[in-house]
């Protein structure tokens, strides 16, 4: 089962899928941008069925996905459904 | 050629339960997400619960959720919906559907479906 | 949850005709919408998926249209085989169907 870990180690995602996932069981997608002492990107997906899963950044899929909400923030307000922060 | 053939469907009363299985063929099963859907005549058609290419996840419609089970059997290609707590509004067909493989192309087969009455 | 509102209902036509029928979406579905022909005691079968993709096997007279929440699938030319029950399906968050149209002889 893949996890996210809440540590005090600055990456939270353990452990990192490619395994794709339709969309519409996504409820919400959070991106962490390499930095704050963790040296890699990290995106940490919500599930519908509340299930969590860190998500290699390098998977085709959720590229796709990432340059959809990027096209669409540029035209729109940001959604705040995909800005959720880890407590 | 692609064949998915439900089974397991009859006469339940409410409160009861029951097993549907779909048995697949013509395909890499293990390699789609697979789902069920019901069409009773007054709803039309809904979505039921979905399962990953492993097993280890699955969705559900809210109105099923807690009741419905949905699972497979890769080594037998095979999908399965345990209904429990069976109520009359789930009285319909229910098809077995493939969903979205690992690329996230969607063919879309469906079985020949299978009835499910709940009465007293 | 997202609704989905397919119109009309019922609708009559003759053999040769144009004919479209309306899906609109509670919220945008981003173009994650299919279409799918229905004839009695018969599986539904997908004729366009994402909105103006048309599945493998099925004629051109066949087209889709839409965006954000207004979704339109159009048949041009009726032919005898086309009278059947039709509706749209969003898998954009999870899925929801519309109620759908019947397509009769007129």
């Known amino acids: 089962v893949l996890e996210v870990y809440y540590t005090h180690l600055r990456c939270r995602c353990v452990q990192e899928s490619s395994v794709f996932i339709p969309r519409r069981f996504i409820d919400r997608i959070q991106i962490s941008p390499r930095g704050n002492g963790c040296p890699r990107k990290e995106i940490i997906v919500w599930k519908k069925n509340k299930s969590v899963v860190c998500v290699d950044p390098q998977a085709e899929w959720i590229q796709r996905i990432m340059e959809m909400l990027r096209k669409k923030s540029s035209s729109t307000p940001p959604v705040p459904v995909f800005k959720r922060k880890i407590p | 050629e692609v064949q998915l053939a439900e089974s397991g469907g009859g006469l339940v009363q409410p409160g009861r339960s029951l097993k549907l299985s779909c048995s697949a063929s013509g395909f890499t099963f293990s390699d789609y997400y697979m789902a069920w859907f019901r069409q009773a005549p007054p709803k039309g058609l809904e979505w039921v619960a979905s399962i990953s290419y492993d097993g280890g996840d699955s969705f559900y419609r809210d109105s099923v959720k807690g009741r419905f089970t949905i699972s497979r059997d890769n080594a037998k290609s095979s999908l399965y919906l345990q209904m429990d707590s069976l109520r009359s509004e789930d009285t319909a067909t229910y098809y077995c559907?493939?969903?979205?493989?690992?690329?996230?192309?969607?063919?879309?087969?469906w079985g020949q479906g299978v009835m499910v009455t709940v009465s007293s | 949850d997202i609704q989905m509102t397919q119109s009309p209902s019922f609708l009559s036509a003759s053999v040769g005709d144009r004919v479209t029928i309306n899906c609109k979406a509670s919220q945008n579905i981003n173009k994650y919408l299919n279409w799918y022909q229905q004839k009695l005691g018969e599986a539904p079968k997908r004729l366009i998926y994402d909105t103006n993709n048309l599945q493998a096997g099925i004629p051109s007279r066949f087209s889709g249209s839409g965006s954000g929440t207004d979704y339109t699938l159009t048949i041009n030319s009726l032919q005898p085989e086309d009278f059947a029950t039709y509706f749209c399906l969003q898998h954009n968050s999870l899925y929801t169907f519309g109620g759908g149209t019947k397509l009769e002889l007129k």
């Open positions: 559907t493939t969903e979205e493989d690992y690329s996230g192309s969607f063919p879309d087969y």
